[in-house]
């Protein structure tokens, strides 16, 4: 019941962090105009990874599309390939997920092979999330520089008579999305990593040794008397199991735990 | 047709308050931010103050900081300015104008002249 | 706040004559986010309040005539009448529409030979 519970629970919080990761994703913004210190301006600045959008006083918004590809920072690039990288994996994560979840009954897949699917989904998740931990902390760290840049530049530009008004940027709500989404898939992943050791058959640390026995048959035979009791030293029908004292017939039926046909 | 008409102007005592009302109608007045400007007679026009189009943004002008509310009724279709502590500087034709693309003035009502007199 | 200087403060012209006026602004009114300059020409003629002629420094507004032009960028900006109309009769200002306060400038005043 824990293992469902586990199982279900790693699911849902993963389903959670990847619908985030996409919000994220697909979000305007990442950063946005930096209002402290700063004039008034009539026009709000804020940016996603696909676009740049400006919203004016006059509450009009015009969003303008990236559509360069090969003109945009390299570090730009590399937190797009790392979000869609956490979405796709995510994507199939959820996809191997749903076939292993415990509640769910697919023909007769045998535990091992749910475990398995289980174990595969939680380092999905877990991958999954790391890529946009990595994709929106790379673009923290871009803007964080950036800042202190422009920053630099607003204290020693003003030499001139015509000042310049210089639009820094800081964290936009994305960031927080992307954050706490790829933390949501990251546990997500660790709880079916979890789940996935209490679905695997259980196996125990001692050996038992089963035997069968042919019982007591004597044979008379011209020329002298010999008994076989198949006590001896005989091990032809000597079997050693790994898993606890069962005889031939209930280790055959063992694999499907609790379905006996 | 895009219409903006003021009312409340006339003449009033230095120090005193007045409310000045824009009635705006021919578009959707709760999507656009609004303004008052003002013109002292046979001079440049100044800005007054804004309201964003929900009322979370208030800016004014240094000069009437203090002492001028802007405020709307957008279910009433009607833009407000509370003026108090009027001093002779404040005489003008203020103008109610409604905010468009590239934070441009693009309808302006026919204006309401204010004279603070003794 | 942003200082608005135009020049110059009247100019006479002939109609059909060609004139240009000049807007000065004490910053820049280019915002980086969308490359626009937030630069608005009004004209105002007599007894009448003004009217949005150019918008984003150089875009006119619907039903305006196509010898208005406005150009520029940054601090320094103009409009241009090609050929200049008796109707054309009036002030001419600019405005910051970037940083409030948004300021006008002082006006040029048109008149005709």
């Known amino acids: 019941m824990a293992v469902t519970a586990c199982q279900g629970l790693g699911f849902v919080v993963s389903l959670i962090g990847i619908a985030g990761i996409i919000a994220a994703t697909c979000m305007d913004q990442w950063s946005t105009q930096d209002l402290y210190n700063n004039p008034v301006t009539a026009v709000f600045n804020y940016q996603g990874l696909w676009r740049s959008c400006v919203r004016e006083s006059s509450g009009f918004t015009e969003c303008r599309g990236y559509f360069t590809l090969l003109g945009l920072p390299a570090m730009l690039q590399a937190v797009r390939a790392l979000m869609i990288v956490g979405i796709v994996l995510g994507a199939i994560g959820l996809l191997v997920s749903i076939f292993a979840l415990k509640c769910i009954r697919i023909g007769s897949m045998e535990d091992s092979a749910k475990a398995n699917m289980t174990l595969t989904s939680g380092i999905m998740f877990i991958v999954s999330g790391l890529c946009a931990i990595a994709g929106v902390s790379v673009f923290a760290n871009m803007l964080v520089t950036n800042f202190w840049m422009s920053t630099a530049n607003m204290y020693t530009g003003m030499g001139g008579m015509v000042q310049t008004v210089q639009t820094r940027y800081t964290f936009g709500a994305a960031l927080f999305v992307g954050w706490v989404a790829g933390g949501l898939t990251l546990i997500g992943g660790v709880m079916m990593c979890i789940a996935c050791r209490g679905l695997a058959p259980e196996e125990t640390n001692y050996k038992a040794v089963s035997y069968h026995a042919s019982g007591h048959s004597v044979a008379y035979k011209p020329g002298g008397f010999k008994a076989s009791t198949g006590f001896g030293s005989n091990t032809k029908n000597k079997k050693i199991y790994d898993g606890g004292a069962r005889t031939e017939d209930e280790v055959q039926s063992y694999p499907s735990k609790h379905d006996y046909v | 047709d895009v219409q903006l008409v003021e009312s409340g102007g006339g003449l009033v005592q230095p120090g005193g308050s007045r409310k000045l009302s824009c009635a705006a109608s021919g578009f959707t007045f709760s999507s656009f931010g609004m303004h008052w400007v003002r013109q002292a007679p046979e001079k440049e026009l100044e800005w007054v103050a804004y309201i964003s189009s929900g009322s979370s943004t208030i800016y004014y002008a240094h000069t009437v900081k203090g002492r001028f509310t802007i405020s709307r009724d957008n279910p009433k279709n009607t833009l407000f300015l509370r003026m108090t502590s009027l001093g002779s500087e404040d005489t003008a034709m203020y103008y109610c104008?409604?905010?468009?693309?590239?934070?441009?003035?693009?309808?302006w009502g026919q204006g309401t002249l204010v004279t603070v007199s003794a | 706040d942003i200082v608005m200087t135009q020049s110059p403060s009247s100019l006479t012209a002939t109609a059909g004559e060609k004139v240009t006026m000049s807007c000065k602004s004490s910053?820049?009114?280019?915002?980086?986010?969308?490359?626009?300059?937030?630069l608005t020409w009004y004209q105002q003629k007599p007894g009448q309040p003004p009217k949005m002629l150019i918008y984003w420094a150089s875009t006119r507004e619907s039903g305006v005539p196509d010898r208005f032009a406005g150009s520029g960028s940054g601090t320094d900006f103009t409009l241009t009448i090609s050929s200049v109309q008796a109707e054309d009769l009036a002030v001419y200002y600019c405005?910051?529409?970037?940083?409030?306060?948004?300021?006008f400038g002082a006006g040029t005043r048109l008149e005709l030979k």
């Open positions: 405005q910051n529409a970037y940083i409030y306060p948004l300021t």
């Open positions: 910053q820049s009114l280019l915002n980086s986010g969308n490359q626009k300059n937030y």
């Open positions: 104008v409604r905010f468009y693309y590239g934070n441009s003035f693009v309808n």
